[in-house]
């Protein structure tokens, strides 16, 4: 009886993992062994796929053949037993353009209101993936163990800090990996649950901001308690980019380091053009703090966010306030290439009531005034790219009076 | 495979100082840290500090600060800790080990025991 | 300094028996945790870290947990080649500290 060819073959890639499955022709017969031959592009001869040889089962893995997974590789098949099948021969496929990115490793630490996720690579020095290592963003979904409502946190990189969680509860994430350049998304890896420690007796500083001052950074951040010290850290922001690298090396800010008070001044030249993370640390003495929130500080945007100038235009019910670029010292306008948010204050010159408007316009209304009294006003610049958040000092306030009623045309 | 080789033993009379090197070899000593830790005769272990080789920068434990020097050379992937005004006290093994991911003090060298004695 | 109170500092088992140590730090130090075994004569080899990871290579009847200030480190299954000192240490802040080390010795 002629044996029937193969049928059904799929090939699997994920990471460096090649398997095959396919379906047998015809179950009646055993003792059926299988075997593959492939042919790379340009080549007439076919040769033997090793791990694919004289196969009982219906899978076989080709992993250790050494592919160059960008080029273009055809497969065929053939039952044996006494005699042999015809070849059934598979689509040609490239390997890179079949793979598909496996299930990341996922590394948790706990602390009482905060997870550090660590995320590598799940196979280490992949071929298919070498060179796009750095090219990997990961997504992850997470949930209160308790409760199952699940939140979904994007364009991740290998290491990720969630805050303002809860102490002593149990959360449970996966994660997966991207590669927008070639559009591909990867497999969940499995559940990992942690619980978070019981509340710390330091809380970390928080609501940490960066400004200049002349030829100088200054670090502000707000404390809970008094008499403590801090200290601050930084570390270059594409370290946290760095595939299968979890070790972190914060460097100190020598000017802030064991500082009495919720601020610190640097020179400006301690950073040289970048992007950076701060953090801030609180002790007492006996008991120390978790690092607060890390925040993104680009000295791009930093240098060159200076408060904005404006002039203001007195009615007697309302100010109409015109910005323009803020001036450098030689009194030449700051070009802003980045879109801006601006935030102005605004107070009776008598009173302590400030109110606020937020404006992405350049020309801003401060309606509901009174006649004939001296408002104050002061604004500030605010980046309006969530993830970079810098803002400006404000500007020295600037006092006018209102005209006398019925000149508001 | 990753391996850390430290000097020999040393006896040394009290209020000299000791130079123990450590010289790692199947990583790039750049991408770590250098930790140094003492263990006194049926003792527990005690950390004297690290050292970041890529720039020098180090951290002592309080303990230590004013009587240790750690200093690296790339160009032969080792590492130095030089402890200073020996008194008895300090008689112990002096282990350097490397700081991986994690911050874990993941592979040791064979430990250099330090006498000091007069 | 943070402290790290290890308990017990002997402890007499036999094969086969579960034993358990633990260590508890003077403050909170999240999950940055490690624990090392050591024989005579050798150096300090990595069990577990972060609480509770097991270094690769290292047996499953090794297993660590706990965060915050109590870390416990388990042997499912006491082996003639456990028998050693194990110290646990954590690495949350500058200085790190260590236990004052759990011999385990034969009944």
């Known amino acids: 009886k002629n044996l029937k060819s193969p049928q059904k073959v799929e090939v699997d890639i994920i990471d460096d993992n090649f398997i095959l499955r396919w379906n047998r022709s015809d179950e009646s017969v055993g003792n059926v062994t299988f075997s593959f031959d492939y042919q790379k592009t340009g080549m007439d001869n076919w040769i033997k796929l090793s791990g694919c040889q004289n196969i009982t089962s219906t899978k076989c893995n080709f992993s250790s053949l050494k592919l160059n997974v960008y080029e273009e590789i055809k497969l065929r098949i053939r039952a044996e037993k006494e005699n042999t099948s015809s070849w059934y021969e598979v689509d040609s496929f490239t390997p890179f353009r079949k793979a598909q990115i496996g299930p990341p490793e996922v590394h948790l630490e706990a602390e009482d209101k905060a997870i550090v996720i660590h995320i590598s690579p799940g196979t280490k020095d992949s071929v298919m993936w070498a060179l796009d290592g750095l090219s990997f963003t990961y997504s992850l979904v997470i949930w209160k163990n308790s409760s199952g409502v699940e939140e979904r946190i994007e364009n991740i990189y290998s290491r990720h800090k969630i805050y303002k969680l809860s102490p002593e509860t149990t959360y449970c994430l996966k994660v997966k990996a991207a590669l927008l350049t070639s559009w591909k998304i990867g497999v969940y890896s499995p559940v990992h649950c942690i619980k978070t420690t019981v509340e710390n007796e330091l809380p970390p500083p928080e609501n940490i901001e960066v400004s200049v001052q002349n030829q100088n950074y200054v670090l502000k951040w707000d404390y809970t308690y008094a008499n403590m010290t801090f200290q601050v850290q930084w570390l270059h922001a594409f370290l946290k980019r760095n595939p299968g690298n979890h070790l972190y090396k914060w460097k100190q800010i020598p000017d802030c380091e064991n500082v009495k008070t919720t601020q610190c001044v640097f020179p400006q030249n301690v950073f040289q053009k970048g992007i950076y993370l701060l953090r801030v640390q609180a002790s007492d003495g006996n008991n120390t703090s978790f690092w607060s929130e890390e925040i993104k500080f680009d000295t791009e945007i930093q240098a060159f966010l200076l408060p904005p100038v404006f002039n203001i235009r007195s009615l007697s019910d309302s100010f109409h306030i015109y910005i323009g670029a803020p001036k450098q010292s030689g009194n030449t306008p700051v070009i802003q290439d980045y879109p801006l948010i601006y935030e102005i204050i605004f107070w009776e010159n008598t009173s302590n009531a400030e109110r606020k408007i937020i404006e992405k316009k350049t020309d801003v209304t401060v309606p509901n005034l009174k006649p004939l009294t001296v408002y104050c006003v002061k604004a500030r610049a605010h980046t309006m790219d969530e993830k970079l958040n810098k803002s400006s000092v404000f500007s020295d306030a600037v006092c006018e009076k209102t005209k006398p009623g019925n000149t508001s045309k | 495979q990753v391996q850390l080789v430290q000097s020999g033993a040393e006896v040394v009379k009290p209020g000299a100082s000791v130079k123990v090197s450590c010289k790692g070899s199947g990583f790039n000593i750049k991408d770590y840290y250098m930790h140094w830790v003492r263990q006194a005769p049926g003792q527990g272990l005690e950390w004297i500090g690290r050292?970041?080789?890529?720039?020098?920068?180090?951290k002592y434990a309080p303990k230590f600060q004013g009587r240790v020097t750690m200093t690296a050379d790339t160009s032969t992937s080792t590492v130095y800790m030089e402890l200073s005004s020996l008194r008895s006290e300090d008689t112990a093994v002096y282990y350097c080990?490397?700081?991986?991911?994690?911050?874990?003090?993941?592979?040791w060298g064979q430990g250099t025991l330090v006498t000091v004695s007069s | 300094d943070i402290q790290m109170t290890q308990s017990p500092s002997f402890l007499s088992t036999s094969v086969g028996d579960r034993v358990t140590v633990t260590c508890k730090a003077s403050?909170?130090?999240?999950?940055?945790v490690v624990w090392y075994q050591q024989k005579p004569g050798k150096s300090p080899k990595v069990l577990i870290y972060?609480?509770?990871y097991r270094v690769s290579g290292v047996p499953s009847r090794f297993s660590g947990s706990g965060s915050g200030t109590e870390f416990t480190l388990i042997i499912s299954s006491v082996q003639p080649e456990d028998f050693a000192t194990y110290f646990c240490?954590?690495?949350?802040?500058?200085?790190?500290?260590f236990g004052q080390g759990t011999k385990l010795e034969i009944k």
């Open positions: 403050q909170n130090v999240g999950t940055n």
């Open positions: 050292i970041d080789p890529e720039d020098a920068e180090t």
């Open positions: 972060s609480a509770s």
């Open positions: 080990a490397r700081g991986g991911n994690f911050y874990v003090m993941d592979y």
């Open positions: 240490q954590q690495k949350n802040n500058y200085p790190y500290t």
